[in-house]
């Protein structure tokens, strides 16, 4: 069977495949940055926010130098699936304060889904296993308060921003080795 409807065909050139994934990742990175800035303007953040259910940042000193393509793609796909779940949760449970950002969160979710489809295609082209997440999925309960949902949004967008930067750096670095 061909690629899912709405997904562009992937070429047989792995560099072109990676290019395409990098482009989508960079676009999503720009969207995330813009939305994070909007969040900061509307709801100023006091320091760093974290959320236990978010994936641990894939970056650590020395990681990028020793990356392999299967590891990067698998880790990225698993992490982005988690972020997708968190964005869906924000849209559903974020409450009235986040309703003003609904169009942007919807667009972000659509871009995330598109990137995930592209990564899935790339992984099947490279005959990589479609790995399931390592840890069990933590159910996301409703935020404790309006402020809780705002803090969660800051944490989700901040984490996604850094994850996407790691992804662009990793994918471009790997492309130089192909």
């Amino acid at each position: 069977p061909g690629p899912p409807a709405g997904s562009p065909r992937v070429s047989s050139d792995p560099r072109a495949d990676l290019d395409s994934a990098v482009l989508l990742t960079r676009s999503l990175l720009a969207d995330t940055r813009q939305l994070a800035a909007q969040m900061r303007d509307k709801f100023p953040a006091d320091g760093d926010h974290s959320l236990d259910s978010l994936p641990t940042l894939a970056m650590s000193a020395g990681t990028l130098g020793s990356l392999q393509l299967p590891g990067v793609l698998t880790r990225l796909r698993v992490d982005l699936m988690s972020y997708l779940r968190h964005v869906q949760w924000l849209r559903r449970a974020g409450g009235p304060s986040l309703k003003t950002l609904e169009p942007e969160l919807g667009a972000l979710q659509a871009r995330l889904e598109r990137l995930l489809r592209r990564l899935q295609l790339l992984m099947s082209r490279l005959a990589l296993p479609q790995a399931a997440p390592d840890q069990p999925v933590i159910p996301l309960g409703p935020p404790a308060s309006a402020w809780g949902s705002i803090r969660a949004a800051h944490a989700i967008l901040g984490g996604l921003h850094l994850t996407l930067d790691w992804a662009v750096r990793g994918l471009l670095l790997l492309k130089t080795r192909l």
């Epitope: 960079r26 720009a30 990028l64 130098g65 921003h161 790691w166 492309k175």
Partner: antibody
Framework: EVQLVQSGAEVKKPGASVKISCKAS????????MDWVKQAPGQRLEWIGD????????IYNQKFTGRATLTVDKSASTAYMELSSLRSEDTAVYYC????????????WGQGTTVTVSS | DIVLTQSPASLALSPGERATLSCRAS??????????IHWYQQKPGQAPRLLIY???NLDSGVPARFSGSGSGTDFTLTISSLEEEDFATYYC?????????FGQGTKLEIK
């Protein structure tokens, strides 16, 4: 005001190492990558590498891999570049620059640190 | 690595004139509507200053007389009406792939 302030000029002997600092202020340090660029006399600007202050490992231009080491002290909003096994062609001005995540354009630059390698 | 070639190497013009600086890449630096080319201005003894990012976006605080255009391998920086403070060296830079590289520069001098 967004600023990057670099350490002062250095004169080194061939074979030695040099470590340059770059202190960031006026913005959230972890929101941007920190990049390093070399400008040797009469040569084009050369990207050395960058580091994500949030905790990402550095990435390097292959030309500098093994000799350049990029680090950050997040608590002090300071980035460092160490260059080892210095030779005369390392004589240059070295700049730190704030890099947009994922896009590698540099919207804020340090004032530059002149490194002279001479016996 | 992608090689960027700037032309002319130097250009002598008078204040008020229009300046057109060119940057050519050894392979395309554009993809699906994004062009990963950026322009900087550098004056003697100073650090470079970002003028234009992603081919055509003016950085904050940069006068509107500066504009960038182009796609694929050919890019242009235009200064519509030169002011005294515009005489400097201009560099293009790409970020399509790693490593990012710079052009050799175009020196803009007062005629």
């Amino acid at each position: 005001e967004v600023q990057l302030v670099q350490s002062g000029a250095e004169v080194k002997k061939p074979g030695a190492s040099v470590k340059i600092s770059c202190k960031a202020s006026g913005y959230t340090f972890t929101d941007y990558n920190m990049d390093w660029v070399k400008q040797a006399p009469g040569q084009r600007l050369e990207w050395i590498g960058d580091i994500n202050p949030h905790g990402g490992g550095p990435i390097y231009n292959q030309k500098f891999t093994g000799r350049a080491t990029l680090t950050v002290d997040k608590s002090a909003s300071t980035a460092y570049m160490e260059l080892s096994s210095l030779r005369s062609e390392d004589t240059a001005v070295y700049y730190c620059a704030r890099g947009e995540l994922g896009h590698w354009y540099f919207d804020v630059w340090g004032q530059g640190t002149t490194v002279t390698v001479s016996s | 690595d992608i090689v960027l070639t700037q032309s002319p190497a130097s250009l002598a013009l008078s204040p008020g004139e229009r300046a057109t600086l060119s940057c050519r890449a050894s392979k395309s630096v554009s993809t699906s509507g994004y062009s990963y080319i950026h322009w900087y201005q550098q004056k003697p003894g100073q650090a470079p200053r970002l003028l234009i990012y992603l081919a055509s976006n003016l950085d904050s605080g940069v006068p509107a007389r500066f504009s960038g255009s182009g796609s694929g391998t050919d890019f242009t920086l235009t200064i519509s009406s030169l002011e005294e403070e515009d005489f400097a060296t201009y560099y293009c830079q790409h970020s399509r792939d790693l490593p990012p590289t710079f052009g050799q520069g175009t020196k803009l001098e007062i005629k």
